[in-house]
C-alpha cells in the first residue's frame, strides 16, 4: 500500500563497501515517516541474492515492512523501528550495507523519561545518568537476561555502538542474538551463557566528541555434574557378632539424587557376571516416605557372619552415577574377649 497523504517518504542510500564492512551510516527519521533504505553496488554491478536484518535478526515482509533485493521500506515508522539495519548477501552473509536508524519525536536521551531537561546547546556527548555508570562488573547467573545501559545526550543526538572485548559486537556474534535499543541506549542479551563473559563497551559519539564505558560481564555457572560423595565414606567397619553397625554416605548433588545401598554377593562362586559387572543385592532404596537423610545411612542390626562383605553406596542423578564402597568384618564374641585380654582394646565399629 502506498504511504498515506500525511506520511513523508525519506530515502537513504549507501554504496556497497569493499570486503571490509564500512562504518554504519547514521540515519534519522521522524515518527510516522516511511523509511526507505537502499543498498546499491557501485556501477550497478549485481550483488546476488540479499537479505535484510534488524539488530542481527532477519526481517520478514509484512503489511508494514516491504523487503526488496536492494531496498527496504518500513511504513509509518515508530520508535520500535529504531535499530541497526543491515543488507547481507544471502549465501555468504557478507554485510553489504549498514544503517543505524533513529526515529525521532522521542526524548533525545532515551532514558530521560523523568522529564529532566537535556542540553539544547550544540555539544559533545555526556552521560545523563552518571550515577548508574559506576558499576563496572556484573556477575549474572547463567540463563538470566542482562542489560547494559549507557544513557547519554548531546547535540546533535549522538549515536551508540557496542564492542565486545574491543571488537564490533553484532547480533550474529552470539547464539540467541542481541537486542540493541537505541532509544534506551541499551544492549540486551537474553539467557546468558559462559561464552558471553567479557568486556562490553558502549561508544557514544557525535561530531563534537566521543565517550565510552566498559562493563565486565561474568556469567556464574553451576555446572551440572553427577553426585559427589564425601571422601572416606562409607568407612570400613569391624564389628562383633550380634552388634549393630551403621555405614554413612554423604551425597552432594545439584540435581535430585537417587541413593541406593548395595551388598556385593556371590553367584555360583563368582562375584562378577560374564560382562564384569558385580553381582549385588539392593538393601535400601528410595521409597515413598524415605528422605535423602535416611538414605545416607545404612543400619545393620544384630550382625551375623553372613553380613560380612563389601557394601556400596550408589548415588545417581540425571547427569550420571557415583559410588563408594566399604568392607564389614564380623568377629566372633570369643575373639573379642581374647583381644581384650591381650591388647586391652576391642575391635568394634
Amino acid at each position: 500500500e502506498p504511504p498515506g497523504p500525511e506520511q513523508r517518504v525519506v530515502r537513504r542510500a549507501a554504496e556497497v563497501p569493499g570486503p571490509e564492512p564500512s562504518q554504519q551510516e547514521q540515519v534519522a527519521f521522524g515518527s510516522g515517516d516511511t523509511v526507505e533504505l537502499s543498498c546499491h553496488p557501485p556501477g550497478g554491478a549485481p550483488t546476488g541474492p540479499t537479505v535484510w536484518a534488524k539488530d542481527g535478526t532477519g526481517l520478514v515482509a509484512s503489511h508494514r515492512i516491504l523487503v526488496g533485493p536492494q531496498r527496504l521500506q518500513v511504513l509509518n515508522a515508530s520508535h520500535e523501528d529504531a535499530g541497526v539495519y543491515s543488507c547481507q548477501h544471502r549465501l555468504t552473509r557478507r554485510v553489504l550495507c549498514h544503517f543505524s536508524v533513529r526515529v525521532t519525536d522521542a526524548p533525545s536521551s532515551g532514558d530521560d523519561e523523568d522529564g529532566e531537561d537535556v542540553a539544547e546547546d550544540t555539544g559533545a556527548p555526556y552521560w545523563t545518568r552518571p550515577e548508574r555508570m559506576d558499576k563496572k562488573l556484573l556477575a549474572v547467573p547463567a540463563a538470566n537476561t542482562v542489560r547494559f545501559r549507557c544513557p547519554a545526550a548531546g547535540n546533535p543526538t549522538p549515536s551508540i555502538s557496542w564492542l565486545k572485548n574491543g571488537k564490533e559486537f553484532r547480533g550474529e556474534h552470539r547464539i540467541g542474538g542481541i537486542k540493541l535499543r537505541h532509544q534506551q541506549w541499551s544492549l540486551v542479551m537474553e539467557s546468558v551463557v559462559p561464552s558471553d563473559r567479557g568486556n562490553y563497551t558502549c561508544v557514544v559519539e557525535n561530531k563534537f566528541g566521543s565517550i565510552r564505558q566498559t562493563y565486565t560481564l561474568d556469567v556464574l555457572e553451576r555446572s551440572p555434574h553427577r553426585p559427589i560423595l564425601q571422601a572416606g565414606l562409607p568407612a570400613n567397619q569391624t564389628a562383633i557378632l550380634g552388634s549393630d553397625v551403621e555405614f554413612h554416605c554423604k551425597v552432594y548433588s545439584d540435581a535430585q539424587p537417587h541413593i541406593q545401598w548395595l551388598k556385593h554377593v556371590e553367584v555360583n562362586g563368582s562375584k562378577v557376571g560374564p560382562d564384569g559387572t558385580p553381582y549385588v543385592t539392593v538393601l535400601k532404596t528410595a521409597g515413598a516416605n524415605t528422605t535423602d537423610k535416611e538414605l545416607e545411612v545404612l543400619s545393620l542390626h544384630n550382625v551375623t557372619f553372613e553380613d560380612a562383605g563389601e557394601y556400596t553406596c550408589l548415588a545417581g542423578n540425571s547427569i550420571g552415577f557415583s559410588h563408594h564402597s566399604a568392607w564389614l568384618v564380623v568377629l566372633p564374641a570369643e575373639e573379642e574377649l581374647m583381644e581384650t585380654d591381650e591388647a586391652g582394646s576391642v575391635y568394634a565399629g
Partner: antibody, heavy 119, light 107 residues
Framework: EVQLQQSGPELVKPGASVKMSCKAS????????MHWVKQSHGKSLQWIGY????????NYNQNFKDKATLTVNKSSTTAYMELRSLTSEDSAVYYC????????????WGQGTSVTVSS | DIQMTQSPSSLSASLGGKVTITCKAS??????IAWYQHKPGKGPRLLIH???TLQPGIPSRFSGSGSGRDYSFSISNLEPEDIATYFC?????????FGGGTKLEIK
C-alpha cells in the same frame, strides 16, 4: 541472606518531616542501587526514586522531587528517606527495595515503614 | 510514564485450581516485567522477572508469559499459602511503574 530491615511506624503532624531508615545486610551495600516505593491505602505502588550508595547519586520521580530526599550511610550500610512538609496525602507505607544490577528489577524488599500524618 | 493496567483487581479460586492475572502496558516494555507476591506486614517477594524467568526457590506452579504490551501471570495447583496480593512492575525504562494489584482469595 539478603535482608532489608526498615525502621518502625511513625505518627507525625502535618507540616513536619520524618526520616526513615533501611538497614541492609547479607550483600555488599555499595554494589546495588536502593529504591524507595510508596503504597497508599487503596492505591497502586508508586516509585519515589533511587540512590546509588557508592557515589550518592540519585534519580527521583518528578512527582516526589520536592517531597523526598534520599541519603545513605555507607559505614552502617543504611539507606534513609526523609519526607518533608507532610500532609495527609503522605500517609502510606514506604518500602525500600534493592535494584538488581544486571537488569533493573527490584529483587529484595524491606517490610515497610508505616507513616501516619495526623494532627 | 508507562501505565500498567492490571486485572482483575480481585479474584477467588479453589484449592488445586489455576488463576491468571494480566498486566497491560501503555507501550511496549520489551519483556521487562516482574511479578511479586505481597502479604500483609511483609515486603513484596519477587516471583518472576523478565516476563517468565522464575526466581530461584520459587515453585514452578508460578509462571509468566507475554511480549510487547500484554503480559500474564499464572498460579496453578493453588495452595493455601498463595493467599496474597500480586502485582506487576515494569522496569523497561528509568521510571519504574506498577500495576494496581490483584487480591487472591481461596474459595
Amino acid at each position: 541472606e539478603v535482608q532489608l530491615q526498615q525502621s518502625g511506624p511513625e505518627l507525625v503532624k502535618p507540616g513536619a518531616s520524618v526520616k526513615m531508615s533501611c538497614k541492609a545486610s547479607g550483600y555488599t551495600f555499595t554494589d546495588y542501587n536502593m529504591h524507595w516505593v510508596k503504597q497508599s491505602h487503596g492505591k497502586s505502588l508508586q516509585w519515589i526514586g533511587y540512590i546509588n550508595p557508592n557515589n550518592g547519586g540519585t534519580n527521583y520521580n518528578q512527582n516526589f522531587k520536592d517531597k523526598a530526599t534520599l541519603t545513605v550511610n555507607k559505614s552502617s550500610t543504611t539507606a534513609y528517606m526523609e519526607l518533608r512538609s507532610l500532609t495527609s496525602e503522605d500517609s502510606a507505607v514506604y518500602y525500600c527495595a534493592r535494584e538488581r544490577d544486571y537488569d533493573g528489577s527490584m529483587d529484595f524488599w524491606g517490610q515497610g515503614t508505616s507513616v501516619t500524618v495526623s494532627s | 510514564d508507562i501505565q500498567m493496567t492490571q486485572s482483575p483487581s480481585s479474584l477467588s479460586a479453589s484449592l488445586g485450581g489455576k488463576v491468571t492475572i494480566t498486566c497491560k502496558a501503555s507501550q511496549d516494555i520489551n519483556k521487562f516485567i516482574a511479578w511479586y507476591q505481597h502479604k500483609p506486614g511483609k515486603g513484596p517477594r519477587l516471583l518472576i522477572h523478565y516476563t517468565s524467568t522464575l526466581q530461584p526457590g520459587i515453585p514452578s506452579r508460578f509462571s509468566g508469559s507475554g511480549s510487547g504490551r500484554d503480559y500474564s501471570f499464572s498460579i496453578s495447583n493453588l495452595e493455601p499459602e498463595d493467599i496474597a496480593t500480586y502485582f506487576c512492575l515494569q522496569y523497561d525504562n528509568l521510571l519504574w511503574t506498577f500495576g494496581g494489584g490483584t487480591k487472591l482469595e481461596i474459595k
